[in-house]
């Protein structure tokens, strides 16, 4: 077999070839959140397990202080699921001038922080009204998409109400990213 | 064009290069489930279409007896959507001492079975309370994430109630995995 | 370092190697939908932002007239999230002969159009009953899976009711695809 048989043509390749097993990747899983100070006017960020059980980081993708650190520029697929659970009273009870009240809601945001840029960028948002009829409820919000990230970017997952996150099992609430 | 222009440096490559088109991949689609014996204390597993319509398996990724067989070790993205449909009575009707009753729920679990390990591992779980007000209801649960798998691992999709799964269309309920 | 150390063996490689950064990719984000003529008996298609903000197309993946154009054959991961919002009256009020009424619903379909084939193919569908109790509601539907596509195929996202789509933020409603 001649090596040339699979040599890429000039048309095909515009970047160095690289082994897939060497790409930055992470899958983080839920841990219990302890009460902390939140930034004003910003949803609180979740912190994560990064090495026990199903969780891992590899190939220079590091997790530190609620953030995934992007080690090289490129297109990444980023995903998260957060399972929420809580209890709501019947949300159609309280009406003002015959109008239905503003429903309770649950929201997940995957946020990018770039040190050179003053404001975080919201990459993905999943938001749901919760209007269960006087009952314990639980439900997941799943997000996933591809983004062009730069070396040094940081990713985090923010939620509307940290006390409603189901932290009991690593398969219910998770966060991951991998270089394509 | 010199072949070396795209030769990876020692720093870049820690595994053999391989063509993307050669990677194990599968997308399975729903079929009508026939009644079968379920294991005690375990949600029943779905079986799948693996070659007709949108469904396929390729590059040594095989489907057999409700399982996707992992042909080589590596990091895989695994996903599934299950659409459920059913009918619930108003779940706040039945109360004991004025308290809301435990809601009905629907659950999907993507499970890994390793022959050398006695217990299956739950990789992903999506679970939702269903508390619709006296109505036919339908809704999907979607899951997807990346996991490090070993050659010989087997993947299946388990559901809380097989009789509620919408098996009518291949685009509503599906299961897939691909090597990254 | 000898180039041969990472030369793929005959067993490993059945297709030309190619750089990942050169693969067709797109992430499209929501824009306000203008009223248009819809095809009879077909859900209306959304149109998208393809270059501003988080949106991009690259490596010959083009967006035109509501469609993503597939520039080369291969296996693609395709995804979309659509966030809906609306207001429903209590949907258990209207009954016929004691039976619950047909609930309102929201549906997203990712559709493939192949010029040589008369009918579009539905690749992915997410559909949910909406039966909120007299309240403003909002919720996302997320879809994602892998499909074998041919050069020249076109992808679009159809929704059951274009007027319920939340077009306010690029992180809430989006559509993307990338060659694996």
């Amino acid at each position: 077999l001649k090596g040339q048989e699979f040599a890429p043509s000039h048309q095909q390749v515009y970047a160095p070839l690289r082994a897939d097993g060497d790409k930055p990747r992470a899958h983080l899983t839920v841990v219990r959140q302890t009460p902390t100070q939140h930034f004003k006017n910003q949803f609180p960020a979740l912190h994560w397990e990064h090495e026990l059980g199903l969780a891992f980081t590899k190939n220079r993708m590091n997790y530190t202080n609620k953030f995934l650190l992007i080690p090289e520029s490129g297109d990444y697929f980023i995903y998260s699921q957060v399972t929420f659970r809580g209890m709501t009273s019947e949300c159609s009870e309280i009406r003002q001038a015959g109008r239905p009240n503003k429903p309770d809601s649950i929201t997940v945001v995957i946020t990018k922080v770039t040190d050179s840029y003053p404001e975080p960028t919201q990459l993905l948002m999943g938001t749901k009204s919760v209007c269960e009829v006087g009952s314990n409820w639980f439900q997941p919000i799943y997000l996933g998409a591809m983004f062009s990230l730069q070396e040094g970017d940081k990713l985090m997952v923010n939620v509307s109400d940290i006390s409603l996150v189901d932290y009991t099992k690593e398969d219910k609430t998770f966060f991951g990213a991998f270089l394509l | 064009l010199k072949g070396q222009e795209f030769a990876p440096s020692h720093q870049q490559v820690y595994a053999p290069l391989r063509a993307d088109g050669d990677k194990p991949r599968a997308h399975l689609t729903v079929v009508r489930q026939t009644p079968t014996q379920h294991f005690k204390n375990q949600f029943p597993a779905l079986h799948w279409e693996h070659e007709l319509g949108l469904a396929f398996t390729k590059n040594r990724m095989n489907y057999t007896n409700k399982f996707l067989l992992i042909p080589e070790s590596g990091d895989y993205f695994i996903y599934s959507q299950v659409t459920f449909r059913g009918m619930t009575s108003e779940c706040s009707e039945i109360r004991q001492a004025g308290r809301p009753n435990k809601p009905d729920s629907i659950t999907v679990v993507i499970t890994k079975v390793t022959d050398s390990y006695p217990e299956p591992t739950q990789l992903l779980m999506g679970t939702k309370s269903v508390c619709e007000v006296g109505s036919n209801w339908f809704q999907p649960i979607y899951l997807g994430a990346m996991f490090s798998l070993q050659e010989g691992d087997k993947l299946m999709v388990n559901v809380s109630d097989i009789s509620l799964v919408d098996y009518t269309k291949e685009d509503k309920t599906f299961f897939g995995a691909f090597l990254l | 370092l000898k180039g041969q150390e990472f030369a793929p063996s005959h067993q490993q490689v059945y297709a030309p190697l190619r750089a990942d950064g050169d693969k067709p990719r797109a992430h499209l984000t929501v824009v306000r939908q203008t009223p248009t003529q819809h095809f009879k008996n077909q859900f209306p298609a959304l149109h998208w932002e393809h270059e501003l903000g988080l949106a991009f197309t690259k490596n010959r993946m083009n967006y035109t007239n509501k469609f993503l154009l597939i520039p080369e054959s291969g296996d693609y991961f395709i995804y979309s999230q659509v966030t809906f919002r609306g207001m429903t009256s209590e949907c258990s009020e209207i009954r016929q002969a004691g039976r619950p009424n047909k609930p309102d619903s929201i549906t997203v379909v990712i559709t493939k159009v192949t010029d040589s084939y008369p009918e579009p193919t539905q690749l992915l569908m997410g559909t949910k009953s909406v039966c909120e109790v007299g309240s403003n509601w909002f919720q996302p539907i997320y879809l994602g899976a892998m499909f074998s596509l041919q050069e020249g195929d076109k992808l679009m996202v159809n929704v059951s009711d274009i007027s319920l789509v939340d077009y306010t933020k690029e992180d809430k409603t989006f559509f993307g695809a990338f060659l694996l």
Partner: antibody
Framework: EVQLVQSGAEVKKPGASVKVSCKAS????????MHWVRQAPGQGLEWMGW????????NYAQKFQGRVTMTRDTSISTAYMELSRLRSDDTAVYYC???????????WGQGTMVTVSS | DIQMTQSPSSLSASVGDRVTITCRAS??????LNWYQQKPGKAPKFLIY???RLQSGVPSRFSGSGSGTDFTLTISSLQPEDFATYHC?????????FGPGTKLEIK
């Protein structure tokens, strides 16, 4: 450091009311549910209810419904529990507790002894 | 309400012993089971959540297991500071209820 500091011991007559305060520090007060749990001498722990400091919404155990009122003052990060129509079997240590999730109690106050005696 | 029972109500053991305390719920509570340690005159201390997950800072000699209705707390090798009362608590649905407690005493 997360801390909950409760008001001091109280002695009350049967039929009276008591109001116990719980001042929170070291975390975002409105971000986490505040619970009240009591423990009668030599007995187990008994959950009384919660308040969501952000919304003011409450959930009381059936046993205390109609007798307990939980309130909060977000400006001073303080939660209050008032128990009315006191009986001798209300003699107990009353704890406030906060959790990272609404269903468990990570951090506890030091407790407030309430004695109901004629 | 969901009733929680614990056994034994008290037990005597020595430093270095392995001890197991069981907790049972009157209906399934999935994995929503928490364990607390309480010493005389003190507030309870959070030990284990989600039936088996150790709260940060809790020594690894403590472990929990179970799901559904039956749960156990195990201390693999008793230390002098472990002699206390242990409470289980269900977090599945309000009203949150505690077991009556298990008093662990020095033999």
């Amino acid at each position: 450091e997360v801390q909950l500091v409760q008001s001091g011991a109280e002695v009350k007559k049967p039929g009276a009311s008591v109001k116990v305060s719980c001042k929170a520090s070291g975390y975002t007060f409105t971000g986490y549910y505040m619970h009240w749990v009591r423990q009668a001498p030599g007995q187990g722990l008994e959950w009384m209810g919660w308040i969501n400091p952000k919304s003011g919404g409450t959930n009381y155990a059936q046993k205390f419904q109609g007798r307990v009122t939980m309130t909060r003052d977000t400006s001073i990060s303080t939660a209050y529990m008032e128990l009315s129509r006191l009986r001798s079997d209300d003699t107990a240590v009353y704890y406030c507790a906060v959790g990272g999730s609404y269903d468990a109690f990570d951090i506890w106050g030091q407790g407030t002894m309430v004695t109901v005696s004629s | 309400d969901i009733q929680m029972t614990q056994s034994p109500s008290s037990l005597s053991a020595s430093v270095g012993d392995r001890v197991t305390i069981t907790c049972r719920a009157s209906q399934s509570i999935s994995s929503y089971l928490n364990w607390y340690q309480q010493k005389p005159g003190k507030a309870p201390k959070f030990l284990i959540y989600g039936a088996s997950r150790l709260q940060s800072g809790v020594p690894s000699r403590f472990s929990g297991s179970g799901s559904g209705t039956d749960f156990t707390l195990t201390i693999s090798s008793l230390q002098p500071e472990d002699f206390a009362t242990y409470h289980c608590q269900q977090g599945s649905s309000p009203p949150f209820t505690f077991g009556p407690g298990t008093k662990l005493e020095i033999k």
